[in-house]
Interface confidence: medium
């Protein structure tokens, strides 16, 4: 394995990131900030690339299948969380001329830097980005119900994952901004409804008088639908992330109709100041029953990385979040304020995750410059346990009843202890008979002076395609040294996040 020039492998890095994004089933498209390190190895006529990519989440859902550089800037009227990441990627190309780059594996760590970048200590308007998004499922359900009333073709859609939740509080009120994915769950699987995936952004505004989040003063929701027929049928997907299941590329994602414009849509979005200061939600009661159970039909997707898995996954692809809302809530009296405005404008029994405007207590203590705040060693084994190559904790989408067989394909590969993989309702182990490729770990938000912990690099060995010795692993251990001509330059427009990345790697 030899170091290579970071700028020389830019085409491969860009392509690899596109393939990673197209592999992912939840979250937001990664955009390339810079190539932090690059090595390559030549085995016969195959080139193996070992890349370290610094990325930032866009505001585009991965479901859009857009090319990462085609994602438009976020709506300036909505708070946009700034989430950075770093990915270690192993990719191969069969011959020098071939454009058939394949991603063999990838490990990413991501973290929000919104609070660390916030300079609002003295501002009366407070923005919170909540890590525990699942608690806002009720609000997503309410918003989707409104959307269904105005769009008949959404009748059989259900909320899948709550991706981001932001709250803006000011003197005029409170706005909750909820992003969530949806899935079509038709009663009858044949003929299959073409619009299987969707992504919605809901803005809910509350008066101070509101005692709960059941009745927003104003609710604005917009949804996009992504047609899987635009993507190839992947029932026979190849085992690696290469051309054959390029889901139609970035030009071919579509939305139903020119983006939906329901009655309360973005034309009359919220005014420049946020609305009334409203209450936080009660803990989610997890009542997600929407009528009788659906017949078990063919799932709309099979996992991208393996064709022999018995059950489809539309889910986490290893995305995990630390559970670090350790707030005690046992001191709440069960007293209700009926027909009475709570002086804080909040229901007295609501719970919140952390606030992001000031330097809150870091869940793992304060770790100043250069240290890895979450106890992650920059290289080698994950200190908390095995890497989740086989997703024992997988999402059943909102449509899928859990399988009867609860066996595992490989044990000991759940989330590391103390980590919580983000899951929707009714989650449990999902059997697999093959290894899932790639993982994304969501770490707690970074504070000023902290840097993003590096993703682990203990990838399992793999045989290269077309190799004489298919049983002999051909990948080398992921390089620990940094290439001399790396890191590359940060792409323009992202200077403020550069401080959160390590500039050099351990030699």
């Amino acid at each position: 394995v030899s170091p290579t020039d970071c700028s020389a492998v830019e085409p491969e890095a860009e392509k690899a990131l596109d393939l990673i994004n197209k592999r992912r089933r939840d979250g937001y498209l990664f955009q390339l900030l810079r190539i932090a390190d690059a090595h390559l190895d030549r085995v016969e006529n195959t080139t193996v690339y070992y890349l370290v990519l610094d990325v930032q989440e866009s505001d585009c859902s991965v479901l859009s299948r857009k090319y990462w550089n085609d994602c438009e800037p976020p709506d300036s009227r909505r708070p946009s969380e700034i989430v950075i990441g770093q990915c270690k990627v192993i990719a191969t190309r069969h011959s020098h001329e071939s454009q058939d780059l394949r991603v063999i594996d990838f490990n990413c760590t991501t973290s929000s830097v919104s609070s660390a970048l916030a300079n609002t200590k003295d501002s009366p308007v407070l923005i919170d980005f909540f890590e525990d998004t699942e608690r806002y499922r009720k609000q997503a359900n309410k918003a989707l119900e409104k959307y269904k009333e105005e769009n008949d073709d959404f009748a059989s859609f259900r909320v899948d994952r709550i991706e981001r939740v932001a709250r803006v509080r000011g003197g005029e009120g409170t706005g909750y901004f909820v992003d969530f994915s949806v899935r079509n769950c038709p009663r009858h699987h044949f003929p299959r409804h073409p619009n299987v995936f969707g992504f919605c952004r809901a803005d809910l505004f509350y008066d101070v008088e509101a005692l709960d989040l059941e009745s927003p003063k104003n609710l604005v929701i917009n949804c996009e639908v992504f047609d899987p027929q635009e993507h190839e049928n992947i029932n026979g997907v190849p085992p690696h992330l290469g051309h054959p299941f390029h889901w139609g590329g970035h030009e071919r994602s579509s939305t139903t109709k020119p983006p939906f414009k329901p009655h309360g849509s973005r034309d009359h979005h919220h005014p420049h100041k946020p609305h009334e200061h409203g209450p936080p939600p009660p803990p989610d009661e997890r009542d997600h029953s929407h009528g009788p159970p659906l017949p078990q039909g063919p799932p709309p997707l099979l996992p991208m990385s393996c064709s022999s898995c018995q059950h489809a996954t539309f889910g986490t692809n290893g995305a995990q979040r630390h559970s670090h809302n350790n707030n005690s809530s046992d001191l709440h009296p069960h007293k209700h304020h009926s027909h009475e405005q709570h002086p804080h404008g909040h229901h007295p029994h609501a719970h919140h995750p952390h606030e992001h405007d000031t330097h809150r207590q870091h869940p793992h203590g304060h770790h100043p410059h250069g240290h890895h705040p979450h106890g992650h060693h920059p290289h080698g084994h994950h200190p908390h346990g095995h890497h989740p190559h086989c997703h024992d904790f997988q999402d059943y989408g909102p449509c899928d009843p859990p399988p009867h067989n609860q066996g595992h394909c490989c044990h000991g590969h759940g989330p590391p202890p103390g980590h919580l993989r983000r899951r929707g309702p009714g989650k449990g182990p999902r059997p697999f008979h093959c290894r899932q490729i790639g993982s994304v770990y969501r770490l707690p938000p970074l504070r000023k002076g902290e840097v993003l912990p590096l993703p682990e690099a203990n990838f399992p060995s793999f045989p290269l395609p077309h190799h004489k010795h298919p049983l002999k692993p051909d990948n080398q251990p992921f390089p620990q040294s940094v290439s001399e001509s790396c890191p590359g330059k940060f792409k323009s427009g992202f200077p403020q996040v550069s401080m959160f990345f390590t500039h050099t790697f351990p030699k």
Partner: antibody, heavy 119, light 106 residues
């Protein structure tokens, strides 16, 4: 209903530390809001001292930053004020109060406790 | 720091009167102006927040208005129980209070 109650010594000697406790009932201090200390000097002037938020983050009045510390005990649903190196100028009635967030407005107040700094 | 000035430190009025107490900020505070009532026993109560929003349980005879740097609290029909000292407070930046206006009965 949220109720706050201050407690602590009513007399402190100069150069020593002033320590007060605010006990909150009817609401968990880790659920939401900012939990503040405000004092009122003889002659009625009110001064905001600082807060500890539900998440544990703190913010202090710059004029007191070198002397003040606000901490909490979530198991007892209490938050605390410590003011070091006090002088007779720190004689005041000390109030704890909760704010909807930060200090935009103080919705609930304790009844106040008078602290006299005197030799 | 933003200075808050209540020019009238004490005010005498008769029961049933309409009373207005004013407060001025040294700079624009974007409507983050709140009014508190402190009774003679020292208890403090929030009456009005964000310039004009009446807190639940506060009688409707209290009202607030203003913008920019100039704000006022009005009691439309003075009652005996309104005898107290009234403070304004800005919450646009680190909070500061006015010096208070003591309301007495003529």
């Amino acid at each position: 209903e949220v109720q706050l109650q201050e407690s602590g010594p009513g007399l402190v000697k100069p150069s020593q530390s002033l320590s007060l406790t605010c006990t909150v009932t009817g609401y968990s201090i880790t659920s939401d809001y900012a939990w503040n200390w405000i004092r009122q000097f003889p002659g009625n002037k009110l001064e905001w001292m600082g807060y500890i938020s539900y998440s544990g983050s703190t913010s202090y009045n710059p004029s007191l930053k070198s002397r003040i510390s606000i901490t909490r005990d979530t198991s007892k649903n209490q938050f605390f004020l410590q003011l070091n190196s006090v002088t007779t100028e720190d004689t005041a009635t000390y109030y704890c109060a909760s704010a909807s967030y930060r200090y935009a407005w103080f919705a609930y107040w304790g009844q106040g406790t008078l602290v006299t700094v005197s030799a | 720091d933003i200075q808050m000035t209540q020019t009238t430190s004490s005010l005498s009025a008769s029961l049933g009167d309409r009373v207005t107490i004013s407060c001025r900020a040294s700079q624009d505070i974007s409507n983050y102006l709140n009014w508190y009532q402190q009774k003679p026993d020292g208890t403090v109560k929030l009456l009005i927040y964000y310039t004009s929003r009446l807190l639940s349980g506060v009688p409707s005879r209290f009202s607030g208005s203003g913008s920019g740097t100039d704000y006022s609290l009005t009691i439309s029909n003075l009652e005996q129980e309104d005898i107290a000292t009234y403070f304004c407070q800005q919450g646009n930046t680190l909070p500061t209070f006015g010096g208070g206006t003591k309301l007495e009965i003529k």
